[in-house]
């Protein structure tokens, strides 16, 4: 069969080769492969200013294989697509486009955001945090004794970091003023860190107020509960002065 095709092609192409290389069924010196052996894909390969036919077992990047009865070729993906499964389903987009459901888009649809690493449109992920851990013991300068007024803190973990368009994380640290019965430090206690001692329960009537840690506040979006107008702030300062325990500003 190959020989008969070779003879026939000679009529259209005077310099048809009898023995074709690399999977060609018929070929010519000028055009390269004219047709391919079964299961191989015909493709045009640019060599300088010239395009020649080649027969490939799989198609190069930017092309997908189309199979029709006894005739296969490499077909170009769409202009905005780098690799594709077929004409209508892209698997990797060209630079500047984002992949979404097999299509390449300039911008991601509503409710999705661009992942600039994978170049895909992905769901927006909001921050998730754990419940607060218990308050730490009341300490001052790292000690749990030898003072009346100190601070205690509590923390919570970020379970899920937000994506670019997701809600930012709320504060993960909170610090508040606390009071303890003034007691002298025993030998060996001096300098012991609060976390090494059992947490002392506050005395009856002790008032405490949580103050979010400034570092975690800076990185968060304003949370409605934290909003206060200036009048409310002044009012609170007056009330706080009247209380036996003062509340510090965010530090």
């Amino acid at each position: 069969q190959n020989a008969s095709r070779g003879r026939r092609q000679r009529r259209m192409h005077p310099n048809v080769s009898q023995g074709c290389q690399g999977g060609c069924a018929t070929c010519s010196d000028y055009n390269g492969c004219l047709s391919c052996k079964p299961r191989l894909f015909f493709a045009l390969e640019r060599i300088g200013m010239k395009q020649i036919g080649v027969c490939l077992s799989s198609c190069p990047s930017g092309y997908y294989g189309t199979r029709y009865p006894d005739i296969n070729k490499c077909t170009k993906c769409k202009a905005d697509c780098d690799t594709c499964f077929n004409k209508n389903f892209c698997t990797k987009c060209k630079s500047g486009f984002y992949l979404h459901l097999g299509k390449c888009l300039d911008n991601c649809p509503e409710g999705l955001e661009a992942n600039n690493h994978t170049m895909e449109c992905v769901s927006i992920v909001h921050c998730e945090v754990s419940e607060w851990n218990p308050w730490s013991p009341c300490t001052k300068k790292g000690k749990t004794c030898g003072f009346k007024r100190g601070t205690e803190t509590r923390v919570r973990e970020i379970i899920q970091h937000p994506s670019a368009k997701g809600n930012l994380c709320p504060p993960t640290n909170e610090t508040r003023k606390c009071t303890v019965q003034r007691k002298k430090c025993q030998k060996g206690e001096r300098g012991k860190k609060g976390r090494e001692r059992k947490r002392k329960k506050p005395n009856k009537g002790e008032s405490k107020e949580a103050i979010p840690d400034s570092k975690s506040l800076e990185s968060s979006k304003e949370i409605p509960e934290q909003r206060e107008n200036k009048q409310q702030q002044k009012k609170r300062k007056v009330q706080d002065k009247q209380k036996s325990v003062s509340v510090s500003t965010v530090h």
Partner: antibody, heavy 119, light 107 residues
């Protein structure tokens, strides 16, 4: 030189089946791809389908349900059957061949045969 | 299916004129384009394949160019025997589709 000659009735009644044969000389239909193309009077060309060197066929989806393309290798002929014809199927029907993507497309044509659909 | 839009649908020219016919595909057809010449009552004749390759025996005044979606057939110096209808054909995928044709008439 490859030659293709179409033959078949020039007149077909509506709802009947149009049958044409293309006889090939100068090459074997067991190589290449053998096509049917039609051209309504005063209009453009429409590709109908092909039968390959192995006998596999592919038809234009717009006509697929009505088309049958077959071959007889012993006579070096291939045929077209188009069922349930209407006046819109009145056209000159051509057979033509190509050998692969790297060579001339429809390098050889038959002279064409006019088929009129009329009662 | 890929649509082929050919223009102009007809043109009048004189012998010796340079004539250009264009074909625009509805999507990138990657150079898989042929041009045909058809005279009244005759079968079409292949002039050019793979955008710019001349079929053996076709005069060199015929040339093809283009890429992507846009393709052109140029007749550098129109001869009396060139008055005919010209069609483009894409064969990037099946079904194959032809342009509507351009009739080149004597001015």
């Amino acid at each position: 030189e490859v030659q293709l000659v179409e033959s078949g009735p020039g007149l077909v009644k509506p709802s009947e089946t149009l049958s044409l044969t293309c006889t090939v000389s100068g090459d074997s239909i067991t190589s290449g791809y053998w096509n049917w193309i039609r051209q309504p009077p005063g209009k453009g060309l429409e590709w109908i389908g092909y039968i390959s060197y192995s006998g596999k066929t592919y038809q234009n989806p717009s006509l697929k349900s009505r088309i049958t393309i077959s071959r007889d290798t012993s006579k070096n002929q291939f045929s077209l059957k188009l069922s349930s014809v209407t006046a819109a199927d009145t056209a000159v029907y051509y057979c033509a061949t190509y050998y692969g993507y790297g060579g001339p497309w429809f390098a050889y044509w038959g002279q064409g045969t006019l088929v009129t659909v009329s009662s | 299916d890929i649509q082929m839009t050919q223009s102009p649908s007809s043109l009048s020219a004189s012998v010796g004129d340079r004539v250009t016919i264009t074909c625009k595909a509805s999507q990138d057809i990657d150079s898989y384009l042929s041009w045909f010449q058809q005279k009244p009552g005759k079968a079409p004749k292949t002039l050019i394949y793979l955008t710019n390759r001349l079929v053996d025996g076709v005069p060199s005044r015929f040339s093809g160019s283009g890429s992507g979606q846009d393709y052109t057939l140029t007749i550098s110096s129109l001869q009396p025997e060139d008055f005919a209808t010209y069609y483009c054909l894409h064969y990037d995928e099946f079904p194959l589709t032809f342009g509507q044709g351009t009739k080149v008439e004597i001015k």
